[in-house]
């Protein structure tokens, strides 16, 4: 079986919880901005 990891911890999405622990960053939403030379520019 492929390694299984649940979705990352509690955030509210229209009263829907992200219920399962998983890697940090999953289901966190996109970063707004552009990465240039290691600096995020809005």
């Amino acid at each position: 079986d492929a390694e299984f990891r649940h979705d990352s911890g509690y955030e509210v999405h229209h009263q829907k919880l992200v219920f399962f622990a998983e890697d940090v960053g999953s289901n966190k939403g996109a970063i707004i901005g552009l990465m240039v030379g290691g600096v995020v520019i809005a």
Partner: antibody, heavy 112, light 112 residues
């Protein structure tokens, strides 16, 4: 409103197959891991399959491994459970669950 | 797999009186992000499980404040400050820190 609606249960003979479906609505289905949990008559809750948000990773306990297959169609907001080589001990109510929300369940009866 | 052990198995209660259910896990439920994914469900007769408490002590949407959760590491407690007739059913603890998602065996709460 979050809703999970199962279908596809019924009476099947030992060795037979069934495919359960779970129609999800009210949330961004493609962003969440999903599971199937079963409950035999008068018994507790048993996880039978889990799948991550993009369908790339799955988990099965030994009791169903090699017989059951979980899958999802994120375009249709639907979760599936293909059950093959069914046994009498697979008789149970099968719930589609996201952890915080559960469907109403669908009864699978395996009997000759 | 993480084993979840609940006690008592059965709990006769008097309306208006407090009640308490214990849950112990075979390993720590603290995840690497510091959160503890220990939850409590109530399954009323003929219904699917409903989430009461998530992450040890957080009441889910619509859950009355007479329900509270506490604990840490491997030992957890669900308390009902004043039991009402509608609280009867089977209570399950559950963990989703570790794969697979696992459940306690249940505690049946009934009115004396």
């Amino acid at each position: 409103e979050v809703q999970l609606v199962e279908s596809g249960g019924g009476l099947v003979q030992p060795g037979g197959s069934l495919r359960l479906s779970c129609a999800a609505s009210g949330f961004t289905f493609s962003s969440y891991g999903m599971s199937w949990v079963r409950q035999a008559p008068g018994k507790g809750l048993e996880l039978v399959a889990s799948i991550n948000s993009n369908g790339g990773s799955t988990y099965y306990p030994d009791s169903v491994k090699g017989r059951f297959t979980i899958s999802r169609d994120n375009a249709k907001n639907t979760l599936y459970l293909q059950m093959n080589s069914l046994r009498a001990e697979d008789t149970a109510v099968y719930y589609c669950a996201s952890g915080d929300y559960w469907g109403q369940g669908t009864l699978v009866t395996v009997s000759s | 797999d993480i084993v979840m052990t609940q006690s008592p198995l059965s709990l006769p209660v008097t309306p208006g009186e407090p009640a308490s259910i214990s849950c112990r896990s075979s390993q720590s439920l603290v995840y690497s992000n510091g959160d503890t994914y220990l939850h409590w469900y109530l399954q009323k007769p003929g219904q699917s499980p409903k989430l009461l408490i998530y992450k040890v002590s957080n009441r889910f949407s619509g859950v009355p404040d007479r329900f509270s959760g506490s604990g840490s590491g491997t030992d957890f407690t669900l308390k009902i400050s004043r039991v009402e007739a509608e609280d009867v059913g089977v209570y399950y603890c559950s963990q989703s820190t570790h794969v697979p998602w696992t459940f306690g065996g249940g505690t049946k709460v009934e009115i004396k």
